[in-house]
Amino acid sequence: LKGQEFAPSHQQVYAPLRADGDKPRAHLTVVRQTPTQHFKNQFPALHWEHELGLAFTKNRMNYTNKFLLIPESGDYFIYSQVTFRGMTSECSEIRQAGRPNKPDSITVVITKVTDSYPEPTQLLMGTKSVCEVGSNWFQPIYLGAMFSLQEGDKLMVNVSDISLVDYTKEDKTFFGAFLL
Amino acid sequence: LKGQEFAPSHQQVYAPLRADGDKPRAHLTVVRQTPTQHFKNQFPALHWEHELGLAFTKNRMNYTNKFLLIPESGDYFIYSQVTFRGMTSECSEIRQAGRPNKPDSITVVITKVTDSYPEPTQLLMGTKSVCEVGSNWFQPIYLGAMFSLQEGDKLMVNVSDISLVDYTKEDKTFFGAFLL
Amino acid sequence: LKGQEFAPSHQQVYAPLRADGDKPRAHLTVVRQTPTQHFKNQFPALHWEHELGLAFTKNRMNYTNKFLLIPESGDYFIYSQVTFRGMTSECSEIRQAGRPNKPDSITVVITKVTDSYPEPTQLLMGTKSVCEVGSNWFQPIYLGAMFSLQEGDKLMVNVSDISLVDYTKEDKTFFGAFLL
């Protein structure tokens, strides 16, 4: 009933009812991408598939240019998994060379951009030191939580190093949000 | 109101309203597994507790023979955590023996089976290389995301090695889904 | 409509409809902890920010004294991430000393307390061995699942070692729940 319900006039309507099926929702899946030059301490954003395979956007939740656009204000559950993989960890080389043993790391950040606000807001961060003994390593970072978002907010997923992202399968690296 | 709402006849009903309490939901918890022979490159499915302790199924969401049965079409949030544990990592032994340093791995896949479709669909995968230095290791892999499912779809959780799954506690290894 | 709907008297009302916007919800974020003495085998509970920054509680979901209070019975999705970090892993020191190589571990438990029930119930546990080669390590543990809760239940997050919890950023360590 598109967020409206007809009730007897004597009843106080505290909040509109709405059908669950018409709530904004999206599940985006990974596509291959190679990093462009990016500024130090500024993590690049991932680009996503939004309509093929398992990916979809619905009910005015749109995807454009690395961003999920929030079409209406409310509480959203937002989630992402990024699977990373690498050939070797420099950590072991640094260790052997006798230099300070500062491990490498992999990081995922789900970021909110509000046009009226100068700085992006980091909603969720998953960060992990990587100091693998093996020559080939791979591992996922999963994030998910609920946030109050405003119409017009934009969501993106940033990573510490795009070249380490496993883009080979749509079930390994993904990003989604839905209105509760 | 079981997905129906009575509204004045002049109103356009875009989508049925339905009470949240009658939506299909399940939370399944780990039980001790019987390792079965499985074909190479075909991960075995876990079976689950569906009614004791923290586990439940409700509103026509049924569990049978390792599968969660989807009773109605819609968007579902699906999740699982599998905790793995092992005594040693063969990785270190392989390394010491001078063989190629290919790390072992642990993998969880949430799979959808549709009877009318010949191949299962992998919805979610969490995969991690394991090359632990310690003689005893343990770690969880968590997955969760939203998918559009059809009535009659079946969901299962597959793992790379059933013998590494920690089945000792219902809070360590679990599987669930709920209609949004 | 606050859980009520007016329907023709001849209709069977199976379950009340209610507006999504008035459901109990909370997202809590990390604050600096004061390490407290705790009994052996009894993990300390974290306390949380509940109103500043990204944190909020709404619709009668209240936070008090390390607990989220459940204001109405129903099925809730509960989640938490705790990011741990440490300077060194004693594991390597233990190994070098020739003692049994039992790795250290980090553990998160989401616990339910019901006043009428003598023992807390562990709903979710994420536990991981830590045997890092690097001198500085950090990693998150994420948990999330659905549970049937009763009005008056209390939820808390317990960790194996408060001193290892990364409290520096609200996006790294958090705890939330919402009525489905």
């Epitope: 596509v31 291959r32 991408q33 190679t34 990093p35 462009t36 030059q37 680009h47 598939e49 309509e51 093929l52 993989r85 690498g86 050939m87 070249s163 380490l164 883009y167 080979t168 | - | -």
Partner: antibody, heavy 119, light 108 residues
Framework: EVQLVESGGGLVKPGGSLRLSCAAF????????MNWVRQAPGKGLEWVGL??????????DYAAPVKGRFTISRDDSKNMLYLQMNSLKTEDTAVYYC??????????WGQGTLVTVSS | ENVLTQSPGTLSLSPGERATLSCRAS???????LVWYQKKPGQAPRLLIY???SRATGIPDRFSGSGSGTDFTLTISRLEPEDFAVYYC?????????FGQGTKLEIK
């Protein structure tokens, strides 16, 4: 600034061999898949083949007309891409371009090198 | 292989007019891997659009791309004299990568 510079083109007889090189500047070469593309005189663009990054096992893939005759390789330490062309045919006459293959994102091209196969 | 068919083969228009170029694929593929190039004699192809709709660096905003699945379009809203060239679409989602046969945009 991203730059790709091809070299090694020239005149060769049918059945002969030639090795093209492509020097890459201004980006992390080892992360990027690389393609060879060609354009025969008066014809359209034609994909020749690709080599993936080492992270993706460095595997190669080729268009049907050149499979078994052409080999793509790379030397990440020198930021160099190569195309070894054997058993050349007159229909291999074209301008050969090396290009980046970044997946989603901007791809870059060299200026091309002319290969003429003629007796 | 995924065959890309461009239409029309030749498009005769005057400066200031709007040009609409079509690219149709024989198989569905991700729009992330659809690009449009401009090619002039003696020059390397110039990337105009990547990901079906994202303008490459330095490309004027009169160039726009759209489409998904199997049908893609390049639009030049107001033709300038320097826009007359051959335009190619390419997919690189599935191997073998393929180009369309090209659309020649000529001055009327």
């Amino acid at each position: 600034e991203v730059q790709l510079v091809e070299s090694g083109g020239g005149l060769v007889k049918p059945g002969g061999s030639l090795r093209l090189s492509c020097a890459a500047f201004g980006f992390t070469f080892s992360n990027v898949w690389m393609n060879w593309v060609r354009q025969a005189p008066g014809k359209g663009l034609e994909w020749v083949g690709l080599i993936k990054s080492k992270t993706d096992a460095g595997t190669t893939d080729y268009a049907a007309p050149v499979k078994g005759r052409f080999t793509i390789s790379r030397d990440d330490s020198k930021n160099m891409l190569y195309l070894q062309m054997n058993s050349l045919k007159t229909e291999d006459t074209a301008v050969y371009y090396c290009t980046t293959d970044r997946g989603w994102g901007e791809n870059y091209w060299g200026q091309g090198t002319l290969v003429t196969v003629s007796s | 292989e995924n065959v890309l068919t461009q239409s029309p083969g030749t498009l005769s228009l005057s400066p200031g007019e709007r040009a609409t170029l079509s690219c149709r694929a024989s198989q569905i593929f991700s729009s992330s891997y659809l690009v449009w190039y401009q090619k002039k004699p003696g020059q390397a192809p110039r990337l105009l659009i990547y990901g079906a709709s994202s303008r490459a660096t330095g490309i004027p905003d009169r160039f726009s791309g759209s489409g998904s699945g199997t049908d893609f379009t390049l639009t030049i809203s107001r033709l300038e004299p320097e826009d007359f060239a051959v335009y190619y679409c390419q997919q690189y989602g599935n191997s073998p990568y393929t180009f369309g046969q090209g659309t020649k945009l000529e001055i009327k």
